[in-house]
């Protein structure tokens, strides 16, 4: 290797200068006696390299690039040799932010799957190869006091999102959790949540029925529908509030919200609907009076009114 | 301290009918589910029944389905179990239980033996 | 309905032993298993919730492990008060089962 470059720092703030010495040994031969170092940045030279020669023979070029504007670049220095430029050496150069403090720390607790899911936004771009952790432990009180720590959780590359599973978590606990970020320029930290898992649970949906019509029950009136539900089996210990939503299958109406229905109903007779009109219904539920998650809504059930009854009385067509 | 005391148990004949209840302290009552499990003498536990916070939903055993009531009044804070048209095989120690979130029982009573033989 | 099948049915065992007992569900319950203890004229304790979580003032020797179909219970280091017998018993949907049950005896 006849040259070597040494940069003050490999990556940078976006913006920031930069320095770069450029270093070619004295027994390069084929060399001339007082070498013109060059510099260049990716494709294009620079100017203002300052060289000298050292005590031990050796040339040394210096640059200063004030502003670094490019997120990723190679700096190389080089020689000309005859009619073309001989690199040197080569270093690639990085430039970008330190991380945002991760923000939007959220998480719910999935009873399937038996872990805690938590997502975050990451903030900005930092143009650099940074990472997130999901940090956390356990706590018997309000997160003040720091217990057990769990094992970190690290998300996939480029995902904002980590789960802890079941061993790690014990429920009716609170835990500390945040998202620390680093890259080469720094650490960031979110503020923490201080969270027991199952305050943060997310049920599955009841699915949805038609009624079965027993013989003695009188059949719906016209506008109404009679509904009945499942709940899901697992949440079925779990108190808990629903609501409904529904509208025509045809046309542009939006969704219309009834709720929050009789607590524990597992039936529910929905009336002031058109007669004779197919509807679309859901229902979704939420662990109530404790703290939680609304379930998604249910797979959708497609249901029809009864006809209005006929009427005896005549119209009269005046023209 | 959460307790929970069981009480009308005894000897009863085939075809008879016990009520037992079941006195909470401890907790407010009418926020968990409640149930019932029993144990025939000399064997495992058998899940008899449940009972939501307010009343609303009351799922059974087979064994017990149709003979067997679980019920509550939550401003006695006490649970009950009407035991109808009463086997042999029902002859066991019924213990209440309270529910948590996930199902399990906990804290159990200390249980009432109920006997069925002529 | 979900059979709940716990093995061995007994064990002996001495005191200062590594004690493991296994629970099997015919479908898969996720994590909705839990563990009881209980004593001879007494009314069952509960050990382990939701597979893992151990309940408040249960001695940390007791562990639960597994999820699907099977679940372990273990007893890090066997104790004289720990000779009783242990049901598991799944709430993933009703009716709720127990296990058979796994007496621990003393050898």
């Known amino acids: 290797e006849c040259g070597h470059i040494s940069v003050s720092a490999p990556i940078v703030h976006l913006g920031d200068p930069i320095t770069a010495s450029c270093i070619i040994k004295q027994n390069c031969s084929h060399l001339d006696p007082e070498p013109q170092i060059l510099w260049r940045l990716g494709a294009e030279l620079q100017p203002g390299g300052r060289q000298q020669r050292l005590s031990d023979g050796t040339q040394e070029s210096i640059i200063t690039l004030p502003h670094l504007n490019h997120t990723q670049a190679f700096l190389s220095c080089a020689l000309n040799w005859g009619n073309s430029l001989q690199i040197l050496d080569q270093v690639e150069l990085r430039a970008g932010y330190p991380p945002a403090i991760p923000h939007n720390l959220s998480c719910l607790m999935n009873l399937t799957t038996s872990s805690l899911i938590c997502q975050w936004e990451p903030g900005p771009e930092t143009h650099l190869p940074t990472s997130f952790t999901l940090k956390s432990f356990k706590s018997r009180g309000n997160c003040q006091t720091q217990g057990d720590s769990i094992l970190d959780c690290v998300p996939k590359d480029g995902q904002s999102h980590c789960s802890i599973p079941r061993k790690h978590l014990l429920l009716y606990q609170n835990m500390g959790i945040w998202v620390q970020a680093e890259n080469a320029l720094g650490t960031s930290m979110s503020p923490q949540l201080c969270l027991d898992p199952m305050a943060v649970v997310k049920l599955e949906p009841p699915m949805l029925r038609t009624m079965d019509p027993s013989p003695e029950a009188a059949p719906p009136q016209a506008g109404c529908l009679q509904l009945s539900w499942e709940p899901w089996q697992p949440g079925l210990h779990i108190n808990q509030k629903c609501e409904l939503r529904h509208k025509p299958q045809r046309g542009e109406a939006s969704w219309a919200l009834v709720g929050p229905l009789p607590l524990e109903a597992l039936q529910y007779e929905l009336c002031g609907l058109l007669p004779a009109t197919a509807y679309t219904l859901q229902i979704r539920c939420i662990r109530w009076p404790l703290p939680g998650h609304w379930s998604d809504w249910s797979p959708s059930l497609e249901l029809r009114t009864t006809e209005r009854a006929p009427t005896h009385h005549h119209h009269h067509h005046h023209h | 301290e959460v307790q929970l005391l069981e009480s009308g148990g005894g000897l009863v004949q085939p075809g008879g009918s016990l009520r037992l209840s079941c006195a909470a302290s401890g907790f407010t009552f009418s926020l968990y589910w409640m149930g019932w499990v029993r144990q025939a003498p000399g064997k495992g536990l058998e899940w008899v029944s449940s009972?939501?916070?307010?009343?609303?939903?009351?799922p059974y055993a087979d064994s017990v389905k149709g003979r067997f009531t679980i019920s509550r009044d939550n401003s006695k804070n006490t649970l009950y179990l009407q035991m109808n048209s009463l086997r042999a095989e029902d002859t066991a120690v019924y213990y209440c239980a309270k529910l948590g979130e996930l199902g399990w029982f906990d804290p159990w009573g200390q249980g009432t033996l109920v006997t069925v033989s002529s | 309905d979900i059979q709940m099948t716990q093995s061995p049915s007994s064990l002996s065992a001495s005191v200062g032993d590594r004690v493991t007992i296994t629970c099997r569900a015919s479908?898969?319950?996720?994590?909705?298993l839990n563990w009881y203890q209980q004593k001879p004229g007494k009314a069952p304790k509960l050990l382990i919730y939701y597979a893992s979580n151990l309940q408040n003032g249960v001695p940390s020797r007791f562990s639960g492990s597994g999820s699907g179909t099977d679940f372990t219970l273990t007893i890090s280091s066997l104790q004289p008060e720990d000779f009783a017998t242990y049901y598991c018993q799944q709430s993933y949907s009703t009716p709720l089962t127990f296990g058979g049950g796994t007496k621990v005896e003393i050898k």
């Open positions: 009972i939501s916070s307010s009343g609303g939903v009351t």
């Open positions: 479908q898969g319950i996720s994590s909705y």
